[in-house]
Interface confidence: medium
C-alpha cells in the first residue's frame, strides 16, 4: 500500500508589524512537537496592508477596520479553519505610534483601542495590540536573524545555509531601518556597556548573551528626511529649497504645516514667511551627505565613545545583518552584493543622484514616482548613518550583509517577538531526542 502522510501536527502564529509608513501581517508556522528546537519556525505568508501606518488614522479611526480587512481575511484563508481558535495574533506598533504617543497619549490609546476591537472580530486568539519599545524592537530583530541563521543551535554544521553565514556560533549584529526610527544591536567584544539603558542580558538555549542595543527615534528614513527639510528651510532665502538630495529637475511642493506636524522637526521649527515651499532637486551626493551629517550631533559624548547625539556605542564587533529599509533601498539601488565595496557604493550613489529626474522616471517607469523620488536621499542617508553615525569604515563595510529574507522568513523584529511571547526560546538547551516523531505510516 502507498505511504500516506498523517495530518500535519503544526501550529500557526500571526504578528502584525504596525510601522510608521505601513502595516504588514506575517504568518508563521512550526511543527507542534518541535516548539523548543531552534530554527523550526518559518514564515508562510506576508501580507502588506494597503495604506499608511496606523498612526495616520488618528482623525479617522472608523476606517481602521476596513484597512485591516484584506490581510486578516488572507490569514483566515491561509490558516486551516481547525487551527483558527488556537492561533495567537499579536500586533506590535513601532516608532510611528511612539511619536503619536509623545504628542498625545489619549490619541495613541484611541487608535490602539480601535485596532484591538477590529482584530478581536476575527476567529483567532487575539493577544493584544501594544506599542513596543525601541529596545524591544532592536532586541527582537537581533533574536530573529540569529534564530534564522542557526546561531543559537549548539549543533555545528559542516555546511552553510546562506551565503553570508560563517560556520561559527558568533552572533550577527542587527541593523534595522524603519520610516521613523533605526536600531543597532550587537554583542560587543569584552566591552562594558557603559549606559544601562543600552544593555540587555539574555540566556538563550543555555548560553548567556550581553547585548548592546539602541533605537534612534526620528532617525528612520522618512523622519530623517523631514528633519533635513526643516533644518534646510531655516536658511532658505525664499520659498524655493534647492535640495541636493533630489534629482536635478525634480520639483515638489511641501506644506509648512506638514513639515512641522511631526515631533521630529520641533527642534528646527520657526516662523516662516510662507505657507508652502518648493523643493527643487539639484542632485549632488556630496552636498546631500554634508546636509545629512548636520542631523548628527557628534560634538558631545559623555562616554568613551558615542554614535551621535551623546548616545553610547561600543566598538563594532563581528558581522551585521542590515534589514528592513536598509535592504529595500540598497536592493533597489542594486547595491546589496557582498562584492560591492563601500567606495563603489559611494561612487554609484554619486552617479545615481546626479541623474536627471526625467531620465530616472524613464529608466524606472514601473516604480511610483513618490517612492522613486526618495532613493537618492535614502541611499545617501544609509551611507551617512552607517559610516558617520555608527562608525563603520571602508574595511568593516564588508561585514555588513544586506538581508531581505533568511530561509524564506523576513528579517525583522516580528519573528523574535512571537518566539518570545509564545515561550519558544528556552533559557536552557532542550534535551535532544534521538528521533523526531515519524510523519509517515
Amino acid at each position: 500500500t502507498q505511504n500516506k502522510a498523517l495530518p500535519e501536527n503544526v501550529k500557526y502564529g500571526i504578528v502584525l508589524d504596525a510601522g510608521s509608513s505601513h502595516t504588514s501581517l506575517y504568518i508563521y508556522k512550526w511543527p507542534a512537537e518541535k516548539e523548543n528546537d531552534t530554527g523550526v519556525v518559518h514564515q508562510v505568508e506576508e501580507c502588506r496592508v494597503k495604506g499608511p501606518g496606523i498612526s495616520k488614522f488618528v482623525q479617522k479611526v472608523n476606517e481602521i477596520g476596513i484597512y485591516l480587512t484584506d490581510c486578516m481575511e488572507r490569514a483566515r484563508e491561509v490558516i486551516p479553519r481547525s487551527q483558527h481558535q488556537e492561533t495567537p495574533v499579536y500586533l506590535g506598533a513601532t516608532a510611528g505610534m511612539r511619536l503619536l504617543r509623545m504628542e498625545s497619549e489619549e490619541l495613541a490609546d484611541r487608535v490602539l483601542d480601535v485596532v484591538e476591537r477590529s482584530l478581536s472580530n476575527y476567529p483567532f486568539d487575539f493577544q493584544g495590540a501594544r506599542i513596543i519599545t525601541g529596545q524591544e524592537e532592536g532586541a527582537y530583530g537581533w533574536i530573529t536573524i540569529n534564530y534564522l541563521l542557526g546561531k543559537f543551535s549548539q549543533k555545528t554544521r559542516w555546511f552553510s545555509i546562506v551565503p553570508y553565514e560563517t560556520n561559527n556560533q558568533e552572533t550577527f549584529g542587527a541593523l534595522d531601518l524603519g520610516g521613523a526610527s533605526t536600531q543597532v544591536t550587537f554583542v560587543p567584544q569584552n566591552q562594558t556597556i557603559e549606559s544601562p539603558d543600552n544593555a540587555l542580558q539574555f540566556r538563550l538555549y543555555g548560553k548567556d548573551y550581553n547585548v548592546y542595543t539602541h533605537s534612534f527615534l526620528c532617525y528612520g528614513k522618512d523622519q530623517a528626511l523631514w528633519q533635513k527639510l526643516a533644518k534646510d528651510i531655516q536658511v532658505a532665502s525664499n520659498e524655493i529649497l534647492r535640495d541636493p538630495c533630489f534629482h536635478p529637475g525634480y520639483k515638489k511642493v511641501v506644506n509648512v504645516s506638514d513639515l512641522y506636524k511631526t515631533p521630529c522637526t520641533k527642534r528646527f521649527e520657526m516662523t516662516l514667511p510662507f505657507q508652502q515651499f518648493e523643493i527643487q532637486g539639484i542632485g549632488n551626493y556630496q552636498q546631500c551627505h554634508q546636509s545629512i551629517l548636520e542631523l548628527f550631533n557628534t560634538s558631545y559624548c559623555p562616554y568613551s565613545q558615542c554614535a551621535f547625539n551623546g548616545i553610547f556605542l561600543p566598538p563594532l564587533q563581528g558581522d551585521f545583518g542590515a534589514f528592513s529599509a536598509f535592504y529595500f533601498v540598497m536592493k533597489f539601488l542594486n547595491l546589496t552584493s557582498e562584492k560591492v565595496s563601500q567606495e563603489k557604493v559611494t561612487e554609484m550613489m554619486k552617479k545615481f543622484c546626479a541623474q536627471p529626474w526625467e531620465e530616472i522616471k524613464t529608466s524606472y517607469a514601473g516604480v511610483k514616482e513618490k517612492y522613486l523620488s526618495e532613493y537618492c536621499f535614502s541611499g545617501t542617508y544609509i551611507l551617512s548613518l552607517l559610516l558617520q553615525g555608527y562608525h563603520f569604515t571602508a574595511d568593516s563595510w564588508e561585514h555588513i550583509h544586506f538581508i531581505g529574507k533568511i530561509q524564506g522568513s523576513d528579517a525583522g523584529w516580528t519573528l523574535g517577538y512571537m518566539l518570545n511571547l509564545t515561550n519558544m526560546i528556552p533559557a536552557e538547551q532542550p534535551l535532544s531526542t534521538p528521533l523526531s516523531h515519524s510523519t509517515y505510516v
Epitope: K50, P52, G53, K56, Y67, K368
Partner: nanobody, 122 residues
C-alpha cells in the same frame, strides 16, 4: 484632484429599494478602499459600507443583510444596492475614497463626493 459624483438617491417607500452609484473621475484601482457614508440631520457622518481594493466588504451592523456594496473597476464606479429600506435610513449618502499611500509617509488623501439625498417615507 479626484472627483466623485453620486447618483441614484431619491424618495422611496419603506420596504423599497434604491441603487446608488459613485463615479470617479479617474481609475479607482489605486484606491485602498471605497465606501459609502451617511449623515442624517443633526447627526455625525457614519460609515455604511466599504469595499477594499482586494474586494473585501465591511458593513455597519444596522445595514447588514439589506445593503450590498460592489465595484466595477472598468467603469471606475462603486455601487450601493439598498433593499428593505427603513425610515431610519433617511440621510444624505456620501461616496468616499481612501487614496494610495503618499510621499515619504505623508497622510494619504481622502476624497468625498457632494452627497445624494435618500428619503424613506410613506
Amino acid at each position: 484632484q479626484v472627483q466623485l459624483v453620486e447618483s441614484g438617491g431619491g424618495l422611496v417607500q419603506p420596504g423599497g429599494s434604491l441603487r446608488l452609484s459613485c463615479a470617479a473621475s479617474e481609475s479607482i484601482v489605486s484606491f485602498n478602499a471605497m465606501g459609502w457614508y451617511r449623515q442624517a440631520p443633526g447627526k455625525q457622518r457614519d460609515l455604511v459600507a466599504a469595499i477594499t481594493s482586494g474586494g473585501r466588504t465591511n458593513y455597519a451592523e444596522s445595514v447588514k443583510g439589506r445593503f450590498t456594496i460592489s465595484r466595477d473597476d472598468a467603469k471606475n464606479t462603486v455601487y450601493l444596492q439598498m433593499n428593505s429600506l427603513k425610515p431610519e435610513d433617511t440621510a444624505v449618502y456620501y461616496c468616499h475614497a481612501i487614496g494610495g499611500s503618499t510621499w515619504f509617509g505623508e497622510d494619504e488623501p481622502d476624497y468625498w463626493g457632494q452627497g445624494t439625498q435618500v428619503t424613506v417615507s410613506s
